[in-house]
């Protein structure tokens, strides 16, 4: 047994650009509080999965009102440590979630409103009894600085809090088979104290308060022999004496559920059904009342006036779970446009936009031509996240930087000769033809099929195409 302790040092804007807006204002003062959730092991678990090692809420911090025009400073914090007691061994490796919550103190109907400001998570290795470990975590534009440690509660000692120590009975040495307790050399390691009443012949324990049964015995105190009249047990080694299957150790053997909880096996482990007033993986958390504020996200707590009565959280729309800790999947409505990826950050929805799109919901088709110059008099044409240049005559390529041969396509009709020109091409027409592309025959009487030629331009002159 022991306690995980968390000390929050600061919560405020992180380094770099894009300082966050202050969470409080003169119109809407607020205060912060923190929630820590611990899970054993280094598994990548969902934020909603149970806090199997325990959870704790901090006190509320001082009321904070933003000073107009001032950048968001480090925000005033609650006093004291967050403490998460653990009853069993400290696992050594653990995952944590630390949430920063804002309690708005304006004139809300139905009491103060809570909203999640930031959530940080991590996976760490930590030996119980060691020094404080310091950490810095960032969540968006916010930065959280904190320290943590795990310490054993006497008489437990060791990196997992599984060894027990007692003061020495004699000044010189410990009892038979028992070592001195480092670093408490004046104390001796004590034998494990199994669950009260655990059969000394048929039961044993690997952790304090446990009672695990030897093969052939069952019951919470390992005092009930396994029946050999029925050979229907689905698991365990065959018994040499009876030829029947004797149940091997199952997840509910020794009843891991504390405080009168009843154990039922699940495909992967066990599940405890807790009596009123208790909850947690092993019914180890007790005495939570509505006064402790167990309902998150503005959930309404009903019942639970005293530690022996259960509470129920009535969740506001958008939240679910026994403590309103789970957020409904809002991204399933696909609010992001143009193929953007939806991210539910808890306090807000965010869209990660595809190239060529921007805006909170990827609703803006970026100006593909912004900052894109088409050379040599070309004009930029937008199109679905990419740009292209419509080049002036004589130029080609993606940015109109390549000089094109305007005569390559043989544009001059009826044997006219083509000449490249800085402003395009010029056709020198064969006798009897005229026009920009020598496309019009000249009639023998001097009239042409064209409207009258512009002044100064005679039929048969080279026609410049602009």
């Amino acid at each position: 047994a022991g306690v995980f302790e968390l000390q929050i040092h600061s919560f405020g804007p992180g380094p770099g650009p894009g300082a966050p807006r202050s969470p409080c204002s003169a119109r809407l003062p607020c205060r912060l509080f923190f929630r820590v959730c611990l899970k054993p092991g280094l598994s990548e678990e969902a934020a909603e999965s149970p806090c199997a090692l325990g959870a704790a809420l901090s006190a509320r911090g001082p009321v904070y009102t933003e000073q107009p025009g001032a950048p968001a400073p480090d925000l005033p914090l609650p006093d004291g440590l967050l403490q998460v007691p653990f009853r069993d061994a400290w696992p050594g490796t653990f995952s944590f979630i630390i949430e920063t919550w804002r309690e708005e103190l304006g004139d809300q109907i139905g009491g103060p409103a809570w909203s999640l400001l930031a959530r940080v998570a991590g996976r760490r290795r930590l030996a119980a009894g060691g020094p404080w470990a310091r950490d810095i975590q960032r969540a968006g534009a916010w930065e959280l600085r904190f320290s943590y440690r795990a310490r054993c509660e006497p008489p437990a000692v060791g990196t997992a809090c599984t060894r027990l120590c007692r003061p020495r009975s004699a000044p010189s040495r410990c009892g038979p088979g028992l070592r001195p307790c480092a670093p408490l050399e004046d104390e001796c390691e004590a034998p494990l104290v199994c669950r009260a009443g655990c059969s000394p012949e048929h039961g044993f324990c690997e952790q304090p308060g446990e009672c695990r049964c030897l093969e052939g015995w069952t019951g919470p105190l390992c005092t009930v022999p396994v029946s050999t009249s029925s050979c229907l047990s689905p698991r365990g080694p065959s018994s040499a004496t009876t030829g029947c299957l004797v149940p091997g150790p199952g997840p509910c053997d020794g009843n891991p559920c504390a405080n009168g909880g009843s154990c039922s096996e699940t495909p992967r482990s066990f599940e405890c059904t807790c009596p009123r007033g208790f909850y947690g993986l092993r019914c180890e958390v007790s005495g939570v009342t509505c006064a402790d504020g167990p309902c998150f996200n503005g959930g309404l707590c009903v019942g639970g006036a005293d530690p022996d009565s259960a509470y129920i959280c009535h969740c506001p729309p958008g939240f679910q779970g026994s403590n309103c800790e789970k957020r409904v999947d809002r991204c399933s409505l696909q609010p992001c446009r143009n193929g953007g990826l939806c991210l539910d950050l808890g306090h807000a929805l965010r869209c990660r936009c595809r190239a060529g799109f921007a805006g909170p919901r990827c609703e803006h088709d970026l100006d593909d031509c912004a900052g894109r110059a088409c050379a040599n008099g070309g004009t930029c044409v937008e199109g679905g996240g990419a740009h292209r240049c419509s080049c002036a005559l004589g130029f080609g390529g993606r940015d109109c930087r390549e000089r094109a041969d305007p005569c390559a396509a043989r544009p001059c009709a009826h044997g006219g000769r083509c000449y490249a020109h800085f402003s395009g091409l010029v056709c020198a027409c064969a006798p009897g033809y005229m026009g920009a592309r020598c496309e019009f025959p000249v009639h023998p009487d001097g009239a042409s099929a064209l409207p009258a030629a512009p002044p100064g331009l005679r039929p048969g002159d080279p026609q410049r195409y602009l």
Epitope: L333, P335, R337, L349, C362, E363
Partner: nanobody
């Protein structure tokens, strides 16, 4: 502030029909996405049908061919026409909307829910 007001829930026999409506009001600049979720006792809340941000319609597999979502943009209202109702459709139906507010930021809103009960 934005309000979503649902109506049309009630009790109906298997095979029957109901029409839910949800009207959005308040400081709305535009409605980006809007639809219906439902939550049966002891179950997670799930999307039933909705208009996505791109304006397309989306349906849960279990209601395709039986439920139809429609909208009246002028009234900022969505409707859910539910036909061939089954016992497993019994749930509280919640309206949800992703709204661009007049101040130009987006917020996600929920209605208070309307109960649909399908029983013989």
């Amino acid at each position: 502030e934005v309000q979503l007001v649902e109506s049309g829930g009630g009790e109906v026999q298997p095979g029957g029909s109901l029409r839910l409506s949800c009207a959005a009001s308040g400081s709305i600049f535009s409605i980006n996405a809007m639809g219906w979720y439902r939550q049966a006792p002891g179950k997670q809340r799930e999307l039933v049908a909705g208009f996505t941000g791109d304006g397309s319609t989306k349906y849960a597999e279990s209601v395709k061919g039986r439920f139809t979502i429609s909208r009246d943009n002028a009234k900022n209202t969505v409707y859910l026409q539910m036909s061939s109702l089954r016992a497993e459709d019994t749930a509280v139906y919640y309206c949800a909307a992703d709204v661009q507010l007049l101040q130009s930021d987006y917020e996600f809103y929920w209605g208070q829910g309307t109960l649909v009960t399908v029983k013989p």
